[in-house]
């Protein structure tokens, strides 16, 4: 069985502020078990930006539909979409574990970059 | 708070078909996830299937696959169990139950007990 | 197949750990159900290996590792007297599968 891989296809994502945003994120595997996480930025400081688990992201909606037991596919998107979005998203999967779960692999980043909404 | 209500539990023949219906409450029924579970007497929990929240993906053990059919109406906060071809074996308690992200169970109905006899 | 003690016993306040084997822990969560009598409502005591519901109280947690889960019932009560299955969701096979459930007696 190949190794879980997190892709994430596009380096970078250029959006109009006001505008919704979608970065798109597939896993090669649905083994390990465990949630995936999207965050803003890398390194301790990093911002979270969705948790297949649980929490409550009002901006953000998830492009597939995560119920599937068959899902690959985590892209998200980012309503109203500000200059204060701007940055590196990492899509991230954990593997399960106890009593934290345990960050297994992250893709390679999206660069979201925002432009001034059209006059 | 969650509801699951199940209904529909009757004494049909062998051969005979019935419709479980389930429903829901007290949360958005649209974005979970539901299975049907059931308890044959003096035995344990059986898990027969399972649908995604938008009802487009559905899942069975092998020993109900091509009898039953899961499906939902999400406008109707309703979950249901189609069975055919009822035999003896299905006589059981079934339960509704909502899945969590990771499709186990966080809640379940009360059960309706459909009993199949000559 | 999950795999689980037909039954265990214990003196109120003591610690109960029941088990359950067979599931593959890269691609297993574990869930726990009580049931008080045959044909009730199962209730849900533990869910994604170690996760207690809000409604459950602390006495109980869970555990999984290697290819077993752990119910542990902290301080155990009468009122706790249950048939309590495992059940496990494999990423594999898209299937949720139960142990035959564990008799717990207070004695």
């Known amino acids: 069985e190949d190794e879980l891989q997190v892709i994430q296809p596009e380096k970078s994502v250029s959006v109009a502020a006001g505008e919704s945003a979608t970065l798109r994120c597939a896993m090669t595997s649905l083994i390990p078990v465990g949630p995936i996480m999207w965050f803003r930025g890398a390194g301790a400081g990093r911002e979270l930006i969705y948790n297949q688990k649980e929490g409550h992201f009002p901006r953000v909606t998830t492009v597939s539909e995560l119920t599937k037991r068959n899902n690959l596919d985590f892209s998200i998107s980012i309503s109203n979409i500000t200059p204060a979005d701007a940055g590196t998203y990492y899509c991230v999967k954990f593997r399960k574990g106890s009593p934290d779960d345990v960050e297994f692999k992250s893709g390679a980043g999206t660069e979201l970059s925002v432009r001034a909404k059209p006059s | 708070d969650v509801q699951l209500v199940e209904s529909g539990g009757a004494v049909v023949r062998p051969g005979e078909s019935l419709r479980l219906s389930c429903a829901a409450s007290?949360?958005?029924?649209?974005?979970?996830?539901m299975s049907w579970v059931r308890q044959a007497p003096g035995k344990g929990l059986e898990w027969l299937a399972g649908?995604?929240?938008?009802?487009?993906?559905?899942y069975y053990i092998d020993s109900v696959k091509g009898r039953f059919t899961i499906s939902r109406d999400n406008s109707e906060n309703s979950l249901y169990l189609q069975m055919n071809s009822l035999t003896a074996e299905d006589t059981a308690v079934y339960y509704c139950?909502?899945?969590?992200?990771?499709?186990?169970?966080?809640?379940w109905g009360l059960g309706t007990l459909v009993t199949v006899s000559s | 197949a999950l795999t689980q003690p037909a039954s265990v016993s214990a003196n109120p306040g003591e610690t109960v750990k029941i088990t359950c084997s067979g599931g593959?822990?890269?691609?297993?969560?574990y869930g726990w159900y009580q049931q008080k009598s045959p044909g009730s409502a199962p209730v849900t005591v533990i869910?994604?290996?170690?996760k207690r519901p809000s409604d459950i109280p602390s006495r109980f947690s869970g555990s999984a590792s290697g290819s077993a889960a752990t119910l542990t019932i902290t301080g155990v009560r009468v009122e706790d007297e249950a048939v309590y299955y495992c059940?496990?969701?494999?990423?594999?096979?898209?299937?949720?599968?139960f142990g035959a459930g564990t008799t717990l007696t207070v004695l």
């Open positions: 139950a909502r899945e969590t992200w990771n499709h186990l169970f966080d809640y």
């Open positions: 059940a496990g969701y494999d990423g594999r096979t898209y299937i949720n599968t």
């Open positions: 007290g949360f958005t029924f649209s974005s979970y996830a």
């Open positions: 869910h994604s290996d170690d």
């Open positions: 593959d822990w890269y691609s297993t969560y």
């Open positions: 649908i995604s929240a938008g009802g487009s993906d559905t």
